[in-house]
């Protein structure tokens, strides 16, 4: 799948939601930041991206599998068993609902209202029976309980 | 498509400084992070800077801190390198690359522009 | 800083035969929470800028030829040219994106 294919608007979830949490010690560090004078914090900024951008890409996979002509390289890789693995071996858990209902619930409307839109529709379309078996399997392991608990953890209402 | 084209570079003398700037189109600049790397004939490829989408974080190779600065106008879609008290190690083609959805993954680079430090 | 070393630093193989490249990791770039490899390859044909080939080790970016494919985990990698076309002739690279990204030696592919 291509990298290139999806723009990230409203400056999402991978772009926006990496940034190191705004305390007071944080600050210091965020001036430290803009002078250049820490190098190590970019492998801590680089290890705070890590889960995101996997959420990240499998949000663009979805929103990238109802373009028809963008479909290629994601059914060669699923025919691969490939793509399913991916999910699976991060995704082991619970049912979408509980993410969604996390989401929609407001803890993260106000930061993420264009993926907030997404699961919803999701969870719509799954609701109503229209998403293929492979999307269903996606979405029921979308909500891990470790990555709901990282979010959590990271008090992403905080972040910048 | 995308494109990104730098602009910039030529001889410079050892301690003195150049600008370097980078022109996006075709994609949406202002959502993604950006990187300079630079591409030296003994030292190979060298991660030079990077600056988050909207210029709140920014972080540099050990080699370049404290004299290079990263910085980008999102209203005019133009990543910049400020580089000062350059020496010969800086010598290298230096490309500005978009970063993918996946951090320090670069999807796409620039046809690069030449900095020559020499007396 | 993860050190990438790439073996060998150049190699030629007639066309239509397979070339491989080796590239090692001074550490582990496997991230376990989503036994996802941060490894990438790059293509870079004569005054050209580095191309994005292969990113997680094994996936194939968008419009990259099937004949190329990425295997390995933990610390060493493999790229696979399966059958060589004249137009591979290039320097390849692997990246590491785990940290600090850092780059290969490059390995120049020619034919034979």
């Known amino acids: 799948r291509s990298l290139q294919d999806t723009e990230e608007k409203s400056r999402s979830f991978s772009a926006s939601q990496a940034d190191p949490l705004s305390d007071p010690d944080q600050m210091n560090e965020d001036k430290r930041h803009s002078q250049g004078t820490f190098t190590s914090d970019y492998s801590k900024y680089l290890d705070s991206r890590r889960a995101q951008d996997f959420v990240q890409w499998l949000m663009n996979t979805k929103r990238n599998r109802n373009n028809i002509a963008k479909r290629h390289d994601e059914f060669e890789r699923h025919a691969e068993g490939t793509f399913t693995s991916d999910v699976s071996s991060y995704l082991e858990g619970q049912a979408a609902k509980e993410f969604i209902a996390w989401l929609v619930k407001g803890r993260g409307r106000r930061d993420f209202p264009e993926e907030v839109a997404i699961v919803e529709e999701l969870g719509r379309r799954h609701a109503d029976g229209s998403f293929s078996d492979e999307m269903n399997t996606i979405l029921d392991n979308l909500a891990a309980r470790d990555f709901i608990n990282w979010l959590i953890q990271t008090k992403i209402t905080d972040r910048k | 498509q995308v494109q990104l084209v730098e602009s910039g570079g030529g001889v410079v003398q050892p301690g003195r400084s150049l600008r370097l700037s980078c022109a996006a189109s075709g994609f949406t600049f202002s959502s993604y992070g950006m990187h300079w790397v630079r591409q030296a004939p003994v030292k190979g490829l060298e991660w030079v800077a990077f600056i988050s989408y909207d210029g709140s974080n920014k972080y540099y190779a050990d080699s370049v801190k404290g004299r290079f600065t990263i910085s980008r106008d999102n209203s005019k879609n133009t990543l910049y390198l400020q580089m000062n008290s350059l020496t010969a190690e800086d010598t290298a083609v230096y490309y500005c690359?978009?970063?993918?959805?996946?951090?320090?993954?670069?999807?796409?680079w620039g046809q690069g522009t030449l900095v020559t430090v020499s007396s | 800083d993860i050190v990438m070393t790439q073996s060998p630093d150049s190699l030629a193989v007639s066309l239509g035969e397979r070339a491989t490249i080796n590239c090692k990791s001074s550490?582990?770039?496997?991230?376990?929470?989503?036994?996802?490899?941060?490894l990438a390859w790059y293509q870079q044909k004569p005054r050209q800028p580095p191309k994005l080939l292969i990113y997680?080790?094994?996936i194939r970016e968008s419009g990259v030829p099937d004949r190329f494919s990425g295997s390995g985990s933990g610390t060493d990698f493999i790229l696979t040219i399966s059958s060589l076309q004249a137009e591979d002739v290039a320097v390849y690279y692997c990246q590491q994106f785990y940290s600090i990204p850092t780059f290969g030696q490059g390995t120049k592919l020619e034919i034979k």
């Open positions: 690359a978009k970063e993918s959805i996946l951090a320090a993954l670069f999807d796409y």
């Open positions: 550490q582990s770039v496997l991230y376990s929470s989503n036994n996802k490899n941060y």
């Open positions: 997680w080790a094994s």
